[in-house]
Amino acid sequence: ATKLTEEKYELKEGQTLDVKCDYTLEKFASSQKAWQIIRDGEMPKTLACTERPSKNSHPVQVGRIILEDYHDHGLLRVRMVNLQVEDSGLYQCVIYQPPKEPHMLFDRIRLVVTKGFSGTPGSNENSTQNVYKIPPTTTKALCPLYTSPRTVTQAPPKSTADVSTPDSEINLTNVTDIIRVPVFN
């Protein structure tokens, strides 16, 4: 069975979060997708979304967030550039399918942004996340206002017993670490 999990990214201010959410392309290729932040006990808040219908490989930028939907591959790419400490939080990708409730994609992203010198954007050789060159022409898409109460989350488990770190061979640098935390089975 598919498990809903969190993947934890620890980055420094000024770096870029660069993640992907996969979806069933036969079902959702042209559906509108969104990037949301989930605050404990609150409704998820949509920060950016693709156009409707979603266009293939067409970057959409909303502030420091860039979404790119690769229809042919069933992948939504999400970049958050020039990260700030206040960007820390739990994020998720969803697919809008009105009149039905949004469909949540795996995995959730637990982003932790810390202060720390990371040089000028793109200059930090230790970073395993790259700073994205913002495309000259991007579209700002209008996002539906509703979000499903079902996607309200509980706080993730406090215990570290469920936390499994990546294999030792991976050698993620000390700038970027990823920890997978099962939320429920």
């Epitope: 498990k3 790119e68 795996f106 395993t128 061979e169």
Partner: antibody, heavy 123, light 107 residues
Amino acid sequence: QVQLVQSGAEVKKPGASVKVSCKASGYTFTSYDINWVRQATGQGLEWMGWMNPNSGNSGSVKKFRDRVTMTRDTSISTAYMELSSLRSEDTAVYYCVRLIGYSSAFKWSFQHWGQGTLVTVSS
Amino acid sequence: DIQMTQSPSSLSASVGDRVTITCQASRDISKYLNWYQQKPGKAPKLLIYDASNLETGVPSRFSGSGSGTDFTFTISSLQPEDFATYYCQHYDNIPITFGQGTRLEIK
């Protein structure tokens, strides 16, 4: 340690299908995407596509879209790549590969490779 | 699709030589570039990721640099075990593509 062990060499006739398996060990199978890369004899590397073993979702390049199916059996930590309507130009070594980062990372660095499976298509 | 052009396609060198291979992308790919080594009959091996980061266990004589469209892979002092084929690969977007390879032979 991370290991990807692939099934043995296959000889197929044009028009037939082949299913290559890739058994993973040494890590949590559902945490990392499996990709497939092929290499015709004496030629370069060609990326075919990816599969997320957790969600079961997959994607492939246009060239293979109508002919390739990527699946998995999480109970035995095994990924499969099936290529149908084989032609002579599909003769190649097929590799399954695990990425460096978790499945949510947009980081397509091919860190762990299977030993390869030679598929020969000949009448 | 982004085209990756490696040069030279082959080169001959001696043990102890400094060797440089270049890879040019058909458009800006930032630092989304990896380098691999492949020996005959073996699977490729990741050497460098994100243009300049050395993969764990890879000797420090291997290095990578560059960003945008032009990238360089260098072996500072060739060892006998370095004779192989080297490939660059981008992942700035989908689909992922590889360079055609550079075959490094003993002079």
